[in-house]
């Protein structure tokens, strides 16, 4: 077992909070499953607290992780039946050993409670239970004592109850009928149906006989079935009051007395020392982390937990570490939140399980309008007018390259960039030069160019004019309507995903 | 027999307030999850919020669309669980259902909560 | 939040016939599907947890199936007490959201 700051909780932290030495001890109580609020402060089934405790005196830089843990094992004895389903509450406390006014100080350091179903006689379960930032790794198991046997710790009750199927004298202690401790061999002669024993050789009588062989009825005694034979020639004696007046014991339980005491035989489905506590059913809610329980609609019939997401066992009492399980690709980080599972990828990756590569035209478009080109083993975004980056998210500015000619001034536009000429300049790009004698404007060409036919030139540049023109207005109206519904989507899922992975995280 | 049983439904006014309660029976009550379910005229179920155990501090989570408005709490020695439900708004117009556990094993029978001016 | 798509949103169906009713999650769920039965102004009963099984005290002509995205519930012959709305729900990620319903309407 172990007691520490659990993983990822920043620096390990001394549990004597820097007051010199102090030592740590464990509180372990264990609660009927079934248990109300009402009854919250009692360990009904017992309780315990850890021995032979090390002083633990913290030194700088040494890990809390290793704190020295009291040796040994933490036995809480239970006397009646072993209810199968039960309640475990852990509490470590500290003991704050230096000099304070009024002696050691001791403060609860954490506290982890939780129901389990446990067999007695099984192996060592394993648990892990965080509270806070603290951790607690324990293993747990039931044990019967001798003669108890079982599951249940079914064992010889010492009373004189009615017959049952386990034999004369011989009846279950616990909510398991079917398991009985063999019968001890009784005096020769007693009487199989009205006696039985405890020891060897001996014959004791159930309620109604009597006798050396309990073969003699009561009532044919000197004295009526209501009263009890008196010392010789006194007649009889009514009885006092006893343990069993009133019936302590509920639900149908018969009571017998027993040395000054009473026990209960409990029907069917029902166990305690007065025959309070029922059978667990689904009723009773015995699935942790809101496991649905199915079937166990009475107390005889079992119940089956079916868990939610990030949790198992039969109670879905244990936390899966869905992270071992590796379920984020590419090199992703794996986050279990408890409800869910999250993958924050890494560069060049997307999607849940970040199984989308981003260096891969397969695996998502760009955005805002964006063509994807593929080469070389990789793959590039060719974006529209006013938008750049990795995947054309970035809105780019589209006067950064200088487009303008001849000293133009270049403005933003919401569908791209404007152009203002320098005088004598004009086009899309200012790249036409505005002859003095007011002739035709024909390109800035390079000088050697100049001297071309300038009829067929300046057709040329007002076909590719209007083409490029005709082209702007049509990639405007799509690129407008594309991405304001791809700016409004990507934008509410990057927001919508970043606020539940800080609010997860949080909570 | 599970019973659950809602009340404090009612009409109340855009930005007014309104508490709802839910008692359960034959149900140990401590050791269940409640969650509190809606459904709004003619349309389908949207869950609202949730609150856990006494032994997870009584988490309470909550649906987007009523978080900083609507407040889960429970008495388990009532058995009873709780929604507090401020600045209400006309959305919030719906039968509100009560249910136990992560998958809404037990509901009750719902109580109306009715939004308008 | 995960979105479930359910389809048909109604149908038409006579005593005895088949009915299947399909949901479709947004993202993979596993197979942390439930459905669930809503007959008018009562409170919706679960039929079948963890995809295909069935929850206590549910007959046998209901069923389920699926895993990963796509889900369905089946009716194998239906009965006059089966007329109702059926939701379906995922309980992979947290919150939990449910299908829009399908409306089971006698023919």
């Known amino acids: 077992h172990s007691f520490g700051p659990g993983p990822g909780l920043g620096t390990p932290r001394s549990p004597c909070n820097a007051r010199g030495p102090c030592r740590l001890f464990f509180r372990v109580c264990l609660k009927p499953g079934v248990s109300q609020e009402a009854t919250e402060s009692l360990c009904a089934l017992g309780a315990a607290l850890s021995t032979s405790v090390p002083v633990y005196t913290e030194h700088p830089g040494e890990s809390a992780a290793a704190l020295p843990l009291p040796d040994g094992l933490v036995r809480v004895p239970f006397r009646d039946a072993w209810p199968g389903t039960f309640s475990l509450v852990i509490e470590t406390w500290r003991e704050q050993l230096g000099e304070h006014a009024g002696g050691p100080a001791w403060n609860l350091l954490a506290r982890v409670v939780g129901r389990r179903r446990l067999a007695a006689g099984g192996p060592w379960a394993r648990d892990v239970q965080r509270t806070g930032t603290w951790e607690l790794h324990f293993s747990y198991r039931a044990r019967c004592e001798p003669p108890a046997v079982g599951a249940a710790c079914a064992r010889l009750c010492r009373s004189r109850s009615a017959p049952s199927r386990c034999g004369p004298g011989l009846r279950p202690c616990t909510p398991f009928p079917d398991e009985c401790e063999a019968p001890s061999v009784c005096r020769p002669g007693c009487s199989p149906e009205h006696g039985y024993c405890e020891e060897p050789d001996e014959c004791r009588c159930l309620e109604g006989w009597t006798g050396p062989l309990c073969t003699v009825p009561v009532s044919t005694s000197s004295c009526l079935n209501s009263r009890v034979p008196g010392p010789a020639s006194t007649g009889c004696l009514l009885p006092g009051p006893g343990p069993c007046d009133g019936n302590p014991c509920a639900n149908g339980g018969s009571c017998s007395e027993t040395s000054g005491s009473f026990e209960c035989a409990c029907p069917r489905g029902f166990y305690g020392l007065r025959c309070e506590v029922s059978g667990v059913t689904c009723a009773d809610g015995p699935c942790f982390n809101g496991g649905l329980c199915v079937g166990g609609e009475d107390p005889d019939s079992a119940y089956v937990c079916h868990c939610p997401p990030g949790f198992q066992g039969s109670n879905c009492e244990k936390r899966v570490d869905r992270c071992s399980l590796q379920p984020c690709q590419n090199g992703g980080l794996c986050l279990d939140l408890g409800h869910a599972l999250r993958c924050r990828c890494r560069a060049g990756f997307a999607g849940p399980r970040c199984e989308h590569d981003l260096d891969d035209c397969a695996g998502r478009a760009c955005a805002n309008g964006g063509t994807c080109v593929e080469g070389g083993g990789s793959r590039r975004c060719s974006c529209a007018l006013g938008f750049g980056g990795r995947d054309c998210r970035e809105r780019a500015d589209p006067c950064a390259s200088r487009p303008c000619a001849h000293g133009g001034r270049c403005y933003a536009h919401f569908s791209g960039l404007v152009c203002a000429c320098a005088p004598g300049y004009m086009g899309v790009r200012c790249e036409f030069a505005v002859r003095p004698d007011g002739a035709d404007a024909v390109p800035a060409a390079p000088r050697g160019l100049r001297q071309a036919d300038p009829q067929r030139f300046l057709a040329g540049v007002i076909a590719v004019i209007v083409v490029v023109v005709i082209a702007i207005v049509a990639g405007i109206v799509v690129l407008v309507i594309s991405r304001k519904k791809r700016m409004a989507k990507y934008e509410k899922a990057e927001i919508k995903e970043m606020g539940e992975m800080h609010r997860e995280l949080n909570a | 027999e599970v019973q659950l049983v809602e009340s404090g439904g009612g009409l109340v006014k855009p930005g007014g307030s309104l508490r709802l309660s839910c008692a359960a029976s034959?149900?140990?009550?401590?050791?269940?999850?409640m969650n509190w379910v809606r459904q709004a005229p003619g349309k389908g179920l949207e869950w609202v919020g949730q609150?856990?155990?006494?032994?997870?501090?009584?988490?309470?989570h909550y649906a987007e669309s009523v978080k900083g408005r609507f407040t889960i709490s429970r008495e388990d020695s009532k058995n009873t669980v709780y929604l507090q439900m401020n600045s209400l708004k006309t959305e919030d117009t719906a039968v509100y259902y009560c249910?136990?556990?992560?998958?809404?094993?037990?509901w009750g029978q719902g109580t109306t909560v009715t939004v308008s001016s | 939040n995960i979105q479930m798509t359910q389809s048909p949103s109604s149908l038409s169906a006579s005593v005895g016939d088949r009915v299947t009713i399909t949901c479709k999650a947004s993202?993979?769920?596993?197979?942390?599907v439930s459905w669930y039965q809503q007959k008018p102004g009562k409170s919706p009963k679960l039929l079948i947890y963890?995809?295909?099984n069935r929850y206590t005290g549910v007959p046998s002509r209901f069923s389920g199936s699926g895993s990963g995205t796509d889900f369905t519930l089946t009716i194998s012959s239906l009965q006059p007490e089966d007329f109702a709305t059926y939701y379906c729900?995922?309980?992979?990620?947290?919150?939990?959201?449910f299908g829009g319903g399908t409306k089971v309407e006698i023919k």
């Open positions: 609150i856990r155990l006494k032994s997870d501090d009584y988490a309470t």
């Open positions: 034959g149900i140990t009550f401590s050791n269940f999850w």
């Open positions: 963890g995809a295909s």
């Open positions: 249910t136990t556990g992560y998958y809404f094993d037990y």
């Open positions: 993202e993979n769920v596993g197979t942390y």
């Open positions: 729900g995922q309980f992979y990620s947290f919150p939990s959201t």
